[in-house]
């Protein structure tokens, strides 16, 4: 048994059929030596007298709102939440696996570029009665500050007869050093909460991985004379890291029609332009990518041709 | 090149074949993400090389201010991996595929830093660690870490490159 | 599967005009950018230009503006390079090719060798 | 126009060795560059597009790497068929252009 917070534990238990569960002693926080008695929840029903309370905690009925009384006065509470363990596993049961990049992704960070800035969001099923709590760090040995805000509900969306909801946060390096090559990976560590049972998640990795820029900015077309050329010019987006010159993007641009089986202009480019062929009713899409490091494409960003 | 007393490399061929060493160390290992190698443990194995860290001046303004500094960590870092890439940890068993570019990254990692530091002139080098897994699985896992580590700085190394060609080429 | 097939040799004097047809089958005509381009004997391969069978919107190489025609028919799913005022120096083999990307070339033809000698 | 430069023009190499043949760019073309091989009597063959894009029903021997002026076609280990001429494209700008192609025969 271990604190998650003040009056909060977590009961880790071996979670498989007949398992003998955990014994936990709860002492009643009050300087009262007699008189004192324990409930469970809203139940009237006195479990135990005395300042502490023995307890076998084998299943979720165990688990809830232990409190201690006296004389119909409440003198303290402690809260028992359960962390299960099967075959060696812990339980995964309140986030969905998003299975992208690989299985087991539960968690899933994407940074607009090397500020130290980072969002992380993770997907369930749950709708009620569900707690998150985010803790990050820079190593884990020694480590590094990272400041995360609360975690919100993002987006909800249906998922065929299933209501999916996208929760997010925000993290911030507290002493980001963009120009430097990591040495040691972005740690995060997630508690979440649902109902009386506890789990927890992590993920581990450089920004350098998760960077996905925002999409170029400003498209603009000029058609060229006498041609079925069109020059197509863009910035860069506004959130990615400057000096551009040192924080340099490639791009990508394409035109096509509404369907991805159309045919198709591409180019490549280092620069903020490109002399492509448009076709009437197709779009050119410029995307970015950091220059010297293979992480994530930006989304597209695009014009139609007309 | 970095000479010694303090001139400039010449930024426009360094920032071409930094951009070279980016594209190979890709083409060595394209495979990020399919091995998460952080998962794999025994990380003092890649915790010894040199990484461009927050006070060795490669950000633009340190680039401004003095580069020497910054070229030589990057100069000590190109070396580093030249030695560790003609290692047996890449030469041992199991053999490279015939058509790897582990060859082509080994003499771009050499070229780029004869461009830094002409002959005659030594900055320090850092000692190389001995590496010497026995297994030849252990060995596959080292390369893989040692490749991913060297994408992330060669990527810092270009940065450089090509700010310095952008602002402080003469 | 997509294939493309090209009409025979054909020898020309200088002067003279050429016309290459290209068949196109395995796919939707319209579906395909195609590009002809040609190789003189013994030479290197040089691009000649585009057509969208779509709509035939083309685009030619600069050596051959002028001289060079492309069409398309969709009802028979074919290409044609009509190539004007022939001198000795276009005695080549024309390629035709299809791909859904514009910017090379996926499918070819089998080539048409075309002779230019008085 | 862009003008691509293949080198070598030839390149004599054993059966089971590997061969590396080279296409240089006058300016960045990124990875606008794509590899052909052409067999004597016959039309060229997609190998490799966007530089190191690897085309289905292309044996695995083939790669290519590279970015910007320098491209690189390896072959890792020539079979009898591979012997044939290889051409790169670049598709950075109109009018696209070959380089002027690389023989590899046998040694």
């Known amino acids: 048994i271990w604190e998650l917070k003040k009056d909060v534990y977590v009961v880790e238990l071996d979670w498989y059929p007949d398992a003998p569960g955990e014994m936990v002693v709860l002492t009643c926080d009050t300087p009262e030596e007699d008189g004192i008695t324990w409930t469970l929840d809203q139940s009237s029903e006195v479990l135990g007298s005395g300042k502490t309370l023995t307890i076998q905690v084998k299943e979720f009925g165990d688990a809830g709102q232990y409190t201690c009384h006296k004389g119909g006065e409440v003198l303290s509470h402690s809260l028992l939440l359960l962390h299960k363990k099967e075959d060696g596993i812990w339980s995964t049961d309140i986030l969905k696996d998003q299975k992208e990049p690989k299985n087991k992704t539960f968690l899933r960070c994407e940074a607009k570029n090397y500020s130290g800035r980072f969002t992380c969001w993770w997907l369930t099923t749950i709708s009620t009665d569900l707690t998150f709590s985010v803790k990050s760090s820079r190593g884990s040995s020694d480590p590094q500050g990272v400041t995360c805000g609360a975690a919100t509900l993002s987006a909800e969306r249906v998922r065929g007869d299933n209501k999916e909801y996208e929760y997010s946060v925000e993290c911030q390096e507290d002493s980001a050093c963009p120009a430097a090559e990591e040495s040691l990976p972005i740690e995060v560590m997630v508690d979440a909460v649902h109902k009386l049972k506890y789990e927890n998640y992590t993920s581990s990795f450089f920004i350098r991985d998760i960077i996905k820029p925002d999409p170029p900015k400003n498209l603009q077309l000029k058609p060229l004379k006498n041609s079925r050329q069109v020059e197509v010019s863009w910035e860069y987006p506004d959130t990615w890291s400057t000096p551009h010159s040192y924080f340099s993007l490639t791009f990508c641009v394409q035109v096509q029609g509404k369907s991805k089986r159309e045919k198709k202009d591409r180019v490549f480019t280092d620069k903020t332009s490109a002399t492509v062929i448009c076709r009437k009713n197709a779009s050119i899409s410029v995307r970015a990518q950091d220059r010297y490091y293979s992480s994530s494409w930006s989304e597209w960003a695009s014009v139609p041709c007309s | 090149r970095a000479v010694p007393g303090g001139s400039s490399p010449a930024w426009t061929q360094c920032q071409q074949l930094s951009q070279k060493l980016c594209t190979l160390a890709w083409s060595a290992h394209p495979l990020v993400g399919h091995m998460d190698l952080r998962e794999e443990g025994d990380e003092e194995t890649t915790n010894d090389v040199p990484h461009i860290q927050c006070g060795d001046g490669c950000d633009p303004q340190g680039l401004r201010d003095n580069s020497q500094f910054c070229l030589q960590r990057i100069h000590q870092g190109l070396i580093f991996y030249e030695k560790l890439l003609g290692s047996d940890i890449f030469t041992g068993e199991p053999s490279l595929l015939p058509d790897s570019p582990v060859g082509q990254l080994h003499a771009s990692l050499l070229g780029l830093s004869q461009l830094l530091q002409p002959e005659g002139h030594h900055w320090e080098t850092q000692q190389i660690p001995s590496l010497s897994p026995s297994q030849p699985w252990q060995r596959l896992l080292l390369r893989f870490k040692i490749l991913r580590s060297l994408q992330a700085f060669v990527a810092v190394a270009a940065r450089v490159f090509a700010h310095g060609a952008a602002t402080l080429s003469p | 599967q997509v294939q493309l097939v090209q009409s025979g040799a054909e020898v020309k004097k200088p002067g003279a005009s050429v016309k290459v047809s290209c068949k196109a089958s395995?796919?939707?005509?319209?579906?395909?950018?195609l590009h002809w381009v040609r190789q003189a004997p013994g030479q290197g391969l040089e691009w000649m230009g585009w057509?969208?069978?779509?709509?035939?919107?083309?685009e030619s190489a600069p050596k051959f503006q002028g001289r060079v025609t492309m069409t398309t028919d969709t009802s028979t799913s074919t290409a044609y390079m009509e190539l004007r005022s022939l001198r000795s120096d276009d005695t080549a083999v024309y390629y035709c090719?299809?791909?859904?990307?514009?910017?090379?070339?996926?499918?070819w033809g089998q080539g048409t060798m075309v002779t230019v000698s008085s | 126009e862009i003008v691509m430069t293949q080198s070598p023009a030839t390149l004599s190499v054993s059966p089971g060795e590997r061969a590396t043949l080279s296409c240089r760019a006058p300016?960045?073309?990124?990875?606008?560059l794509h590899w052909y091989q052409q067999k004597p009597g016959q039309a060229p063959r997609l190998l490799i597009y966007?530089?190191?894009q690897s085309i289905s029903g292309i044996p695995a021997r083939f790669s290519g790497s590279g970015s910007g002026t320098e491209f690189t076609l390896t072959i890792s280990s020539l079979q009898s068929e591979d012997f044939a001429v290889y051409y790169c494209?670049?598709?950075?700008?109109?009018?696209?252009?070959f380089g002027g192609g690389t023989k590899v025969e046998i040694k």
């Open positions: 395995g796919y939707t005509f319209t579906d395909y950018y």
């Open positions: 057509i969208d069978p779509e709509n035939g919107d083309t």
């Open positions: 090719n299809a791909n859904k990307e514009l910017r090379y070339f996926d499918v």
């Open positions: 300016q960045s073309i990124s990875i606008n």
């Open positions: 494209q670049q598709s950075n700008s109109f009018p696209l252009t």
């Open positions: 966007f530089a190191s």
